[in-house]
């Protein structure tokens, strides 16, 4: 009755701050229209990096301020986050709520660790 | 801080209608599902329905489908129930819940006392 | 539908004991979907556990969780005063949403 919801354990961001990872949730029925959230736990805090809702079939869309992007693919949400920084190293969770059509369903990920690093200043060349 | 205040409460007899507001404060409305729980006197916590974040996918309990209409206007931070044809079983203390990030029913409101009789 | 059933109904002890509440579905419950609340008299009910093992903010370390798939249980391991309410378990895993019918743990 439960869904599962898989990703990663863990991603490295790249030099440029920008990370991404797959998420795939078992869906129990039809869904034609899906609920995928960014969630960021640090000490036992949650907070929401961004949500966007899609019809099956059809591209997922952010907010035009949002700093994730993503693709669809059948049960599969491909995520990419921007802008990251040092300070934003944690566990990203990703959920995905079946809205439509009944019943409801709820799957939250275990959460993605994210780890970025700041790159190093260039040195200055005289 | 996080704040769920319902109204709309009081004695109505049976085969009428009430409407039963929840206004809500100290957090973005839209980012949150939420639902009615009620509770009939000395009993247990009985789900009734659920709204979606914009309004469009909506749930309901067998016990009011058909009889209770649930809606929500984000920019006025607003959740309602619509409560039509009313039994002496739907009297109850009727509350709003915020749905937490992770699913559970993280925030409730202090209550609102409906009461069906003749 | 998923039927959460409590036991015991009503739960007697005296502050200083340890409080074990338990809570069965009719199905499989991930145990990312099962919470518990505690209700006292004329209060709406507050979140105490969710993931089945989770803390709420604020909630003391004498109350914990556990459980796997149908089987769940709610502990607290030294009773305070402020602890003799009604528990109910929940699953929100899927609709419709369900809740036990409640352990009442009274004063001995």
């Known amino acids: 009755k439960a869904m599962h919801v898989a990703q990663p354990a863990v991603v490295l961001a790249s030099s440029r701050g920008i990370a991404s990872f797959v998420c795939e949730y078992a869906s129990p029925g039809k869904a034609t229209e899906v609920r995928v959230t960014v969630l960021r736990q640090a000490d036992s805090q949650v907070t929401e990096v961004c949500a966007a809702t899609y019809m099956m079939g059809n591209e997922l869309t952010f907010l035009d301020d949002s700093i994730c992007t993503g693709t669809s693919s059948g049960n599969q949400v491909n995520l990419t986050i921007q802008g990251l920084r040092a300070m934003d190293t944690g566990l990203y969770i990703c959920k995905v709520e079946l809205m439509y059509p009944p019943p409801y369903y709820l799957g939250i990920g275990n959460g993605t660790q994210i780890y970025v690093i700041d790159p190093e200043p260039c040195p200055d060349s005289d | 801080q996080v704040q769920l205040v319902e109204s709309g409460g009081g004695v109505v007899q049976p085969g009428r209608s009430l409407r039963l507001s929840c206004a809500a404060s100290g957090f973005t409305f839209s980012s949150y599902t939420m639902h009615w729980v009620r509770q009939a006197p000395g009993k247990g916590l009985e789900w009734v329905t659920f709204i979606s974040y914009d309004g469009n996918n909506k749930y309901y309990a067998d016990s009011v489908k058909g009889r209770f209409t649930i809606s929500r206007d984000n920019s006025k931070n607003t959740l309602t129930l619509e409560m039509n044809s009313l039994t002496e079983e739907d009297t109850a203390i009727y509350y709003c819940?915020?749905?937490?990030?992770?699913?559970?029913?993280?925030?409730w409101g202090q209550g609102t006392l409906v009461t069906v009789s003749s | 539908e998923i039927v959460l059933t409590q036991s015991p109904g009503t739960l007697s002890l005296s502050p200083g004991e340890r409080a074990t509440l338990s809570c069965r579905a009719s199905?499989?419950?991930?145990?990312?979907?099962l919470a518990w609340y505690q209700q006292k008299p004329g209060q709406a009910p507050r979140l105490l556990i969710y993931g089945a093992f989770s803390r709420a903010t604020g909630i003391p370390d004498r109350f914990s969780g556990s459980g796997s798939g149908t089987d769940f249980t709610l502990t607290i391991s030294r009773l305070e005063p402020e602890d003799f309410a009604v528990y109910y378990c929940?699953?929100?895993?899927?609709?419709?949403?369900?809740f036990g019918q409640g352990t009442k743990v009274e004063i001995k």
């Open positions: 819940a915020r749905t937490g990030w992770l699913g559970p029913f993280d925030y």
């Open positions: 199905q499989s419950v991930g145990s990312s979907y």
């Open positions: 929940q699953q929100y895993g899927s609709s419709p949403w369900t």
